[in-house]
């Protein structure tokens, strides 16, 4: 059986229904069987877990997703084996295997792979700071969201009115969420906001930086 699945990965927002398209061409016999299985990201296909079977005219959802899986067409014997997965969770991200068996049609292995990403907005990030906050020193402001798919990009902005920092004194990494401030001056003091953004939305946190004279301590 030759199975056809989309070549591009599928993305579905958190809580919505994912339709994993799988079609095939074969003269369906009584021995026809369909199996959908799931493998977590980074794991080999051999570690897949079944989530739905169709055999002998009956449908058998199985495993932790069993209450949320169904077929677009039941029975799936018309050439359409598309899986519907409702109320998608972050843990549904991974590779789904559609396998059609129909002896004696052994033309190919009857297997199709679909990568699903569940899109999750960034969670409220955590802002933190480390380093020397005295004049002339350097500090790193860090920002990280524990949730978000695809991985959020981070952007730091300083709130309020302030003199333009000298070039190179503020360097940020949008991927790691780190903002490096060098050659600190008293005017570097203020509130800094980090905004974590992906295609599902954004979330932010704020941090107040107090730059002190070298003899004094630091306040965060």
């Amino acid at each position: 059986v030759e199975v056809k699945v989309p070549t591009e990965p599928l993305s579905t927002p958190l809580g919505k229904t994912a339709e994993l398209t799988c079609t095939y061409s074969t003269s369906v016999g009584d021995s026809f069987a369909l199996e959908w299985s799931f493998v977590q990201p980074g794991k080999p296909i051999s570690e897949s877990h079944p989530i739905l079977y169709f055999t002998n005219g009956h449908l058998y959802p199985t495993g932790s997703k069993s209450k949320r899986v169904s077929l677009l067409q039941n029975p799936p014997t018309v050439g359409v084996a598309t899986l519907k997965l409702t109320d998608v969770h972050p843990s549904d991200t991974g590779t789904y295997l559609c396998q059609v068996n129909n002896p004696p049609d052994f033309y190919t292995n009857g297997l199709g792979l679909i990568n699903l990403t569940v899109l999750v907005p960034p969670s409220n990030p955590l802002c933190s700071q480390s380093g020397q906050t005295s004049v002339g020193g350097s500090t790193a402001l860090r920002c990280s969201s524990s949730e978000g798919a695809p991985k959020p990009v981070y952007n730091w902005v300083r709130l309020g009115t302030f003199p333009t920092p000298s070039p190179g004194s503020m360097v940020q990494d949008e991927v790691s969420g780190q903002l490096i401030l060098t050659n600190l001056s008293l005017t570097s003091s203020g509130t800094y906001r980090c905004v974590a953004t992906n295609q599902m939305g954004s979330a932010s946190c704020e941090l107040t930086l107090s730059v002190t004279e070298p003899s004094q301590g630091r306040v965060a």
Partner: antibody, heavy 118, light 107 residues
Framework: EVQMVESGGDLVKPGGSLKLSCAAS????????MSWVRQTPDKRLEWVAS????????HYPDSVKGRFTISRDNGKSTLYLQMSSLRSEDTAIYYC???????????WGQGTTLTVSS | DIQMTQSPASLSASVGETVTMTCRAS??????LAWYQQKQGKSPQLLVF???TLPEGVPSRFSGTGSGTHFSLRINSLQPEDFGSYYC?????????FGGGTKLEIK
């Protein structure tokens, strides 16, 4: 030699019923998916029903769903098509066809004619 | 349902000529397409399946090409027995549908 012989075609009034038969030989009937395909007077071909090797799965296009029933008797190597609520647009030559491993039709019978007319 | 459109509806040619007829699908069929030949008063006969595979016994002057939505059947060096009607059929998802046919006549 693969052979399929259809029978049962007739002149039927609209709303009437009829059962077609197809006697197959020359191949292992019980291992083969089978279909009925019709050819209308304007020469168009239309697939009307299919059945899996053991009869577990049957399929129909919307045009005949609920009116036609395909069945088989593997012991007799015979395919059937029970037709009811017949309409004038069902007038056609009905062919019995064997399906290949893929759903194309590799052997056809000689056909039997159904005419639906008052 | 997948619609199948054949062109031309009819075609005149002489023995020895080469002819090509086409079949267009309303959706992607990959290579799931068959061609049939039907002579006057006879039942259809399979000529090509999977777009380009010839069953045993079909002369090599017949050839099928195409994938996706566009398909062609070519007959090289026409023989007297090649005249008749030709139909395409998709063998993808149910319902399986046929084109309206191309009638090949002797010029």
């Amino acid at each position: 030699e693969v052979q399929m012989v259809e029978s049962g075609g007739d002149l039927v009034k609209p709303g009437g019923s009829l059962k077609l038969s197809c006697a197959a030989s020359g191949f292992t009937f019980s291992n083969s998916g089978m279909s009925w395909v019709r050819q209308t007077p304007d020469k168009r071909l239309e697939w009307v029903a299919s059945i899996s090797d053991g009869g577990l799965y049957t399929h129909y296009p919307d045009s005949v769903k609920g009116r036609f029933t395909i069945s088989r008797d593997n012991g007799k190597s015979t395919l059937y098509l029970q037709m009811s609520s017949l309409r004038s647009e069902d007038t056609a030559i009905y062919y019995c066809a064997r399906q290949g491993v893929r759903p194309f039709f590799d052997y056809w019978g000689q056909g039997t004619t159904l005419t639906v007319s008052s | 349902d997948i619609q199948m459109t054949q062109s031309p509806a009819s075609l005149s040619a002489s023995v020895g000529e080469t002819v090509t007829m086409t079949c267009r699908a309303s959706e992607n069929l990959y290579s799931y397409l068959a061609w049939y030949q039907q002579k006057q008063g006879k039942s259809p006969q399979l000529l090509v399946f999977n777009a380009e595979t010839l069953p045993e016994g079909v002369p090599s002057r017949f050839s099928g090409t195409g994938s996706g939505t566009h398909f062609s059947l070519r007959i090289n060096s026409l023989q007297p027995e090649d005249f008749g009607s030709y139909y395409c059929q998709h063998h993808y998802v149910i319902p399986w549908t046929f084109g309206g046919g191309t009638k090949l006549e002797i010029k």
